[in-house]
């Protein structure tokens, strides 16, 4: 179970907004965050950007098979995985991993799940049980998110979690009865 | 915020028709499967089948086969549960549900609508 | 079809009991596709616990849930007024099937 990864393909990327924009469901009671007032870093900064989008973070490919109990679906699944340090679009490498090539003086960015998309899923069971059909949630594109001071550490923690898909054994946060759960529209992706 | 509202209560006629709506809001239907279930006085929940409203594909439980018709229009994002030859079995409130989306491969129906309330009475 | 059996049916516990339902399944399923739903009179069920022992989104930490199987369980470490309701066994698969409930009334 977990990742069934074959294909690790990383890209850089910078975020847009896109048609179906979400962000996750526990950051957005924070609806400043991404204004250009709050964005950038201090003046005495030499790259001093306005706009949040002007970042860019790491897309990275992942494949991994879906599972419900002990059905497994017929084919994996690709969706990508959020990953790396934000920074300036035009600062950002094309190779990956040369070590701390910016790091910002002022507040931090995250490279954080932006868009989702919604994918019907076959599944087989073993032991003749019939198929199962289900849905899945895979995130479509990344962004670059900005953290403040201001962030507890539960929020940081929630950054980090976004940006891998819950394992077994780890507890997925439900969005059952929360406030927070306002889900955008999702990309239709069949 | 995800929110299914559900039509106001019906009072029907013995082998009349019913078809209740259920609209939702915070979500697109054509992402989710929409479940209906059933739920007669003072006793348990039964399930009667779900759709796939991207694709209009439903399921049934053999017994509401034929009784139950489950549709649903995304343009209004709205699902749609028909019953009909009714009879005073089918006295209940009928739930509509979202399954919600994998997470750490666990599936069930995370919110419910306020329920709709059928009576068969002559 | 997989038939869920609750007992019992109906219990009454005073403020600060243990309190433990019993789901038994009629063939053995995955933990992952066992659910508990909470009904309160006049109102919709509401999804309490997934996946056999996750709690859902502001579900009070004295509830939990264990079991694998064909035996599942609900526990609620101490007992308080506002845990008085339906409780329901589920389990979806390829159909969806709920147990007959179990009534918890405060003593």
């Known amino acids: 179970q977990g990742w069934q990864a074959f294909k690790n393909d990383a890209t850089e990327i910078i975020p847009e907004l896109g048609e179906y924009p979400e962000p996750p469901p526990e950051l957005e009671n924070n609806k400043t965050m991404n204004r250009a007032e709050n964005g950038g870093r201090p003046p005495h900064h030499p790259f001093e950007t306005k706009d949040v989008s002007e970042y860019s973070c790491r897309e990275l490919h992942f494949t991994r098979y879906v599972t419900d109990g002990p059905c497994r679906s017929a084919k994996p699944v690709t969706e990508l995985v959020c990953s790396g340090q934000c920074g300036p679009a035009r600062l950002l490498p094309n190779a990956i991993g040369r070590g701390k090539w910016w790091r910002p003086s002022g507040p931090d960015f995250r490279c954080i799940p932006d868009r989702y998309r919604a994918q019907r899923v076959q599944l087989l069971c073993p032991g003749g049980e019939a198929p199962r059909a289900r849905k899945v949630r895979l995130v479509a594109s990344c962004k670059c998110k900005r953290l403040t001071r201001f962030h507890n550490q539960s929020e940081l923690k929630d950054f980090g979690t976004e940006a891998a898909r819950p394992q077994k054994g780890r507890k997925p946060r439900p969005r059952a009865r929360s406030a927070k759960a306002n889900q955008a529209e999702l990309e239709n992706a069949y | 915020e995800v929110q299914l509202r559900q039509s106001g209560a019906d009072l029907v006629k013995p082998g009349a028709s019913v078809k209740l709506s259920c609209t939702a809001s915070?979500?697109?239907?054509?992402?989710?499967?929409i479940h209906w279930v059933k739920q007669r006085p003072e006793q348990g929940l039964e399930w009667i089948g779900r759709i796939d409203p991207d694709n209009g594909e439903s399921t049934y439980v053999p017994k509401f086969q034929g009784k139950a018709t489950i549709t649903a229009d995304t343009s209004s994002n709205t699902a749609y549960l028909q019953l009909r030859s009714l009879t005073s079995e089918d006295t209940a409130i009928y739930y509509c549900?979202?399954?919600?989306?994998?997470?750490?491969?666990?599936?069930?129906?995370?919110?419910w609508g306020q329920g709709t309330s059928v009576t068969v009475s002559s | 079809e997989i038939v869920l059996t609750q007992s019992p049916a109906l219990m009454a516990a005073s403020p600060g009991e243990k309190v433990t339902i019993t789901c038994s399944v009629s063939s053995s399923i995955s933990s992952s596709n066992l659910h508990w739903s909470q009904q309160k009179s006049g109102t919709s069920p509401k999804l309490w616990i997934y996946?056999?022992?996750n709690l859902a989104s502001g579900v009070p930490v004295r509830f939990s849930g264990s079991g694998s199987g064909t035996s599942y369980s609900l526990t609620i470490s101490s007992m308080e007024a506002e845990d008085a309701a339906t409780y329901y066994c589920q389990q979806w698969t390829t159909t969806y099937t709920f147990g007959s409930g179990t009534k918890l009334e405060l003593k």
């Open positions: 915070g979500f697109n239907i054509k992402d989710y499967y």
């Open positions: 996946g056999t022992s």
């Open positions: 549900g979202r399954e919600g989306l994998d997470y750490g491969d666990y599936y069930a129906v995370d919110y």
